[in-house]
């Protein structure tokens, strides 16, 4: 039987069935998303040569993808739990429009793209429960997101392939940094 998030199992005969802690659950959720990204990257790399593109070429993109910086307090030096948590949640909210863009970009991994999108929404909910200072979290403007989505979808094929590759690579890096930081909390 399922143990709903944050609730105790009523099965006293099996003490080992206590539910996952909040930290365990978040850890698993991130690894679940990373697994989906890995499958999507496999399809992207098989389909195009984007994965071999030089870092310089990738750096030329004009996508404003969330990235961890020193000031965000998520690195070991200058670690700040609250600042970092706000950055992680804000970053995930900003990634949502890019995950929406990915939805029609895959043929054989369509289900994986959906899984990444849905499980990211769940992760955001888990982290929002953990955050004390929700006021500091800025939600992206829906109108801005809608026009960004339209712009991305209007790109030529090569740019769309490049955009897909960059989103997956950046999201993977962001989640890996988040995972390391959250394990310190």
């Amino acid at each position: 039987a399922p143990v709903p998030p944050g609730e105790d199992s009523k099965d006293v005969a099996a003490p080992h069935r206590q539910p996952l802690t909040s930290s365990e659950r978040i850890d698993k959720q991130i690894r679940y998303i990373l697994d989906g990204i890995s499958a999507l990257r496999k399809e992207t790399c098989n389909k195009s040569n984007m994965c071999e593109s030089s870092k310089e070429a990738l750096a030329e993109n004009n996508l404003n993808l969330p990235k961890m910086a020193e000031k965000d307090g998520c690195f070991q030096s200058g670690f700040n739990e609250e600042t970092c948590l706000v950055k992680i949640i804000t970053g995930l909210l900003e990634f949502e429009v890019y995950l929406e863009y990915l939805q029609n970009r895959f043929e054989s991994s369509e289900e994986q793209a959906r899984a990444v999108q849905m499980s990211t929404k769940v992760l955001i909910q888990f982290l929002q429960k953990k955050a004390k200072n929700l006021d500091a979290i800025t939600t992206p403007d829906p109108t801005t997101n809608a026009s960004l989505l339209t712009k991305l979808q209007a790109q030529n094929q090569w740019l769309q392939d490049m955009t897909t590759h960059l989103i997956l690579r950046s999201f993977k890096e962001f989640l890996q940094s988040s995972l390391r930081a959250l394990r310190q909390m």
């Epitope: 539910p19 697994d35 499958a39 289900e111 499980s119």
Partner: nanobody, 117 residues
Framework: AVQLVESGGGLVQPGGSLRLSCAAS????????MDWYRQAPGKQRELVAS???????MAADSVKGRFTISRDNAENMVYLQMNSLKPEDTAVYVC???????????WGRGTQVTVSS
């Protein structure tokens, strides 16, 4: 909902082997990440091994090289092959499924493994 039923536990001598099975009901098995946990009396629950949806595996340091986790998506099964068993492996072994779509975890009732001469 997902129901999990473990089997394959028992009494085994040190150095021996066992293969645990976990049968899952439900149509969403292929989207579940699967784990084996264990809990010895008076001890903390310990993650033994994990297998992701795509088949990526992970094993705890204490069992690396001895225990192997695998899954069969066609049969809705997860296995834990345990070799070179030691007395300290004695515990209740529990199968757990994690659904990232909902963030829910599902637990079996466990199967007892006792390693003793």
């Amino acid at each position: 909902a997902v129901q999990l039923v473990e089997s394959g536990g028992g009494l085994v001598q040190p150095g021996g082997s066992l293969r645990l099975s976990c049968a899952a009901s439900g149509s969403i098995f292929s989207r579940l990440a699967m784990d084996w946990y264990r809990q010895a009396p008076g001890k903390q629950r310990e993650l033994v091994a994990s297998i992701s949806r795509s088949g990526t595996t992970m094993a705890a340091d204490s069992v690396k090289g001895r225990f192997t986790i695998s899954r069969d998506n066609a049969e809705n099964m997860v296995y834990l092959q345990m070799n070179s068993l030691k007395p300290e492996d004695t515990a209740v072994y529990v199968c757990m499924a994690f659904d990232g779509y909902s963030g829910s975890d599902y637990w079996g009732r466990g199967t007892q493994v006792t390693v003793s001469s």
